[in-house]
């Protein structure tokens, strides 16, 4: 298991923005819009547009409310008039330099419309949302906009028992079959399009991979086993012919393995998926966040995936069939038979159209009906390493955003940034054999749920944006100002922190005007480029015989073991005499002569099996008549 | 061949329950959603509820809720509608039907008729 | 809930003449360019039987003469040419929204 953060930072001890108008609640989309610097929330029944480098100042506003006729009807269907029969924003997605495309539930009605950026005003289009954005607020949902059509993954019905993945096309719609085998009550969690590359394969289509859990149709359990899934459609897609008119042929799924090799700890409930994609990176990476099922002791997993991992069971793996046993009990197998050509499920590429199938509508109805009857892979998506890259105790991760950053030496590092359903972001880098929790920072006053995280990687202005039911916060990459000593910043193992001897400070890298000439940093901990040693402070303190001393000694680190010394001997709190408050602060009963002199608080910290100490407070004792 | 048979006829007392089955074959039970349809004396059609087989989990007509209960056996490939509190008006005829990928229902029970009567 | 009205209630048709049943919708059944409405055949004593999916798609087995129109909120199922078989009653129904819901039904004789 990861170890714990080494540092904690409480919500009023660091920089944090924070937005909130009162009386909104559920401020669950955001969308970053990076050459406007400015970041687009929605929330419950309203849309703002704040600035992102500070999001306290709001630029404009709309809101989107529910009229009270539409809110009886939908409590005459049973639901809360005063939560549920409301407008969530659930659907918020650029258009067109001077559009969005915004969808919200609208009391179990779901609609869109479009949002001129210009008036910050909607234009009153009022397009029906179904199969776009769910009806019910608690229900799943993801979405993306590629190449100004929206693909969804959602519940398609009142009774939110109808998923749907869906494209939304004024030329072209496509949905999934409204089949258990297709989806099977799946909880949507992540979509986004990978556009081919361009250095692959002549005539490649791009690709929209969708992530969720289902209840699993191959494994049978005595309860509902859930399993986390990532489809694949094709954006060239346009359905087929006869069969499968107006529906996905290119759609296939596939199960996401996250597990702890050679132990019984399988993550099978997905949290959150974010691709990384980084300039020296050779394709894009998944990165996904897990909890177990049975999930009564708080676990949480990451694990990364390569797209050449993803794509290669998708184009190369193995299908499933349902097989009925014993007249209609069903059961599922790998299909050994013969596989149809063009291969089910792939897009139309340039070898697809050497043999004159150029869209989907040309495909054989035997491709089409092989598609149709087996969408799900046999072969299963493995992470990188066949290992989770971080198993968390006493944790639920909510969401995960990751940034590539360059240390000092040059070195990259992916850095994670997790939420927690008790408002608090860990920051984790991943080292070469071990991944190291750099710190935790409390983001919102109450422990509440981390609804949506956002990254924004502009060069020279990184920050976190997090979204919750009260608000949104800001917050950047790191707080390397905190670290108050060379040792600090080093021990910090923060890739975007370094030591400036110059100014005595500890300093974020790639901020645009700074010179990094003769900074100090070591992503193995190792402390010794730090001669500067801080000048010894110390505090000079009088007691009267017999009473009580408290001496203070403040440690940032969780991984630190503090050490009291006196006469350079180490001080036992099993010993009458002394005793320590909070395992920091020393308390020294019944004070005479012999206990006047100096006391050190040293802080030790283990860092790749070497131990790092360093001196954290001084204090002069003397014990007075 | 795919077939739906229900079980048979029922005559009950006013504020009992009664539980119909629907016993599938000649497909995979898994793979399709059960609906159920109930048709009174002289009337037409009613859509009551549905459920997925592999879940169990069922979503019902708000008019029919706390009225039905549908539940699934795998092992046996049943599906099952319990009508509790019965009274005069319950009396119907009460179909399953296989919700087809068309969004349809393909093939339908026999129906089972259920009579309350004091 | 969507509403769903046949007309006529009832209809007589001589044997060998063309039979309309219409169905409107109180409000769109389309979804991206699909009409979910079905039309089923049911004779008595008998559960109903599909005959026509998605407005327009004729059920495997069910004759010809049975063809589906429509889009949006108004629906028609017309018998080319009525047979002595095809006396019962047709209803409509949508599965674009739950709760799915049917017509009243139209009765079909032979004049």
């Known amino acids: 298991f990861a170890p714990v953060p080494r540092l904690t930072w409480e919500h009023g001890e660091v920089g944090l923005v924070q937005f909130h108008k009162p009386g909104i609640f559920n401020y669950s989309a955001l969308l970053m819009s990076e050459d406007k610097d400015t970041l687009y929330v929605g929330a419950r029944e309203a849309v703002f547009a704040v600035n992102a480098l500070n999001i306290s100042e709001k630029q404009h506003e709309v809101y989107w409310k529910v009229s009270e006729d539409k809110k009886s009807k939908c409590a005459e269907k049973g639901k809360s008039k005063q939560t549920e029969c409301l407008n969530y924003i659930r659907v918020l997605q650029p258009l067109s330099s001077t559009s969005l495309y915004v969808c919200g539930t609208n009391a179990f009605q779901p609609t869109c419309d479009h949002l001129n950026l210009t008036s910050f005003k909607f234009l009153g289009k009022s397009e029906d949302g179904k199969g776009r954005c769910p009806f019910d607020p608690a229900h799943s949902y993801t979405s993306v906009m590629v190449g100004g059509e929206l693909y969804s993954g959602t519940s398609y019905n009142f009774l939110g028992s109808e998923p749907i993945i869906s494209r939304n096309s004024s030329h072209s719609p496509l949905r999934t079959e409204y089949a258990i085998p297709w989806l099977n009550e799946p909880s949507f969690v992540f979509a986004d399009v990978i556009q081919k590359s361009p250095d692959g394969p002549e005539g490649e289509d791009d690709k929209v991979y969708f992530f969720f859990t289902e209840v699993s149709v191959e494994y049978e359990f005595v309860f509902k086993l859930m399993i986390p899934r990532v489809a694949r459609v094709c954006k060239g897609d346009q359905g087929g012919l006869r069969t499968l008119q107006k529906k996905w042929t290119s759609f296939l799924k596939a199960r996401l393995i996250c597990s702890k090799p050679d132990s019984g700890l399988v993550f099978n409930i997905l949290q959150d998926v974010f691709v990384l994609r980084a300039p020296g990176l050779k394709e894009p990476v998944f990165y996904a966040v897990f909890t177990p099922q049975l999930n009564n002791v708080g676990l949480s997993a990451v694990c990364a995936y390569t797209l050449a991992t993803v794509e290669a069971v998708f184009s190369r793996g193995k299908y499933m069939q349902s097989a009925t046993v014993e007249q209609s009990h069903t059961k599922w197998v790998r299909y050994n038979g013969p596989v149809p050509t063009p291969r089910p499920g792939a897009c139309i590429d340039s070898e697809a159209r050497a043999a004159n199938y150029t869209s989907s509508l040309n495909l054989p109805d035997k491709t089409l009906q092989f598609v149709k009857d087996h969408p799900l892979m046999d072969d299963s998506v493995t992470p990188i390493d066949n290992r989770p890259k971080l198993i968390k105790k006493d944790v639920n991760y909510t969401q995960i955003v990751v940034d590539r950053t360059q240390a000092l030496d040059g070195t990259f590092y992916d850095v994670m940034f997790i939420s927690t359903d008790r408002g608090a972001l860990h920051k984790a880098v991943i080292l070469t054999k071990e991944v190291h929790v750099i710190e935790e920072t409390q983001l919102f006053r109450d422990s509440e749920p981390v609804l949506t995280l956002l990254l924004s990687s502009k060069k020279g202005r990184k920050f976190v944006y997090a979204g919750s039911n009260s608000g949104v916060v800001q917050a950047p990459l790191a707080f390397c100002e905190k670290h108050g000593s060379c040792e600090d910043c080093v021990l910090a193992r923060d890739p975007y922190c370094a030591w400036s001897p110059a100014i005595k400070a500890c300093v974020t890298l790639h901020q645009e005007e700074a010179s990094s000439r003769g900074w100090i940093q070591d992503m193995s901990g190792d402390t010794s480029s730090c001669l500067d040693k801080s000048k010894e402070s110390f505090n000079q303190h009088f007691f009267k015989h017999g009473g009580t001393a408290e001496l203070k000694c403040f440690q940032k680190s969780n991984l630190a073991r503090v050490v009291w010394k006196f006469q350079n001997g180490e001080l036992k709190a099993a010993s009458p005499k002394y005793g320590f408050v909070g395992r920091k602060h020393l308390l020294i009963f019944n004070l005479s002569d012999g206990d006047s002199g100096v006391y050190q608080c040293l802080s030790e910290e283990r860092v790749r099996n070497k131990t790092v100490s360093q001196l954290l407070a001084k204090h002069v004792l003397e014990v007075k008549m | 061949q795919v077939q739906l048979v229900q079980s048979g006829a029922e005559v009950k007392k006013p504020g009992s329950s009664v539980k119909v089955s629907c016993k599938a074959s000649?497909?995979?039970?898994?793979?399709?959603?059960m609906h159920w349809v109930r048709q009174a004396p002289g009337q037409g059609l009613e859509w009551m509820g549905q459920?997925?087989?592999?879940?169990?989990?069922?979503s019902y007509n708000q008019k029919f809720k706390g009225k039905a209960t549908i539940t699934v056996d795998k092992s046996t490939s049943t599906a099952y509608m319990e009508l509790s509190s019965l009274r005069s008006e319950d009396t119907a005829v009460y179909y399953c039907?296989?919700?087809?990928?068309?969004?349809?229902?393909?093939?339908w029970g026999q129906g089972t008729t259920v009579t309350v009567s004091s | 809930d969507i509403v769903m009205t046949q007309s006529p209630d009832s209809l007589a048709v001589s044997l060998g003449e063309r039979a309309t049943i219409n169905c409107k919708a109180s409000?769109?059944?389309?979804?991206?360019?699909?009409?979910?409405m079905n039309w089923y055949q049911q004779k008595p004593g008998q559960p109903p039987k599909l005959l026509i999916y998605?407005?327009?798609n004729l059920e495997s087995g069910v004759p010809d003469r049975f063809s589906g129109s429509g889009s949006g909120t108004d629906f028609t199922l017309t018998i080319s040419s009525l047979q002595a078989e095809d006396v019962a009653v047709y209803y409509c129904?949508?599965?674009?929204?739950?709760?799915?819901?049917f017509g009243q039904g139209t009765k079909l004789e032979i004049k």
């Open positions: 459920i997925n087989p592999t879940t169990g989990g069922a």
């Open positions: 000649g497909y995979s039970f898994s793979d399709y959603y």
């Open positions: 129904q949508q599965s674009n929204e739950d709760p799915y819901t």
């Open positions: 998605a407005a327009s």
């Open positions: 039907a296989r919700y087809y990928y068309g969004r349809h229902f393909d093939v």
């Open positions: 409000q769109s059944v389309d979804y991206d360019g699909d009409s979910y």
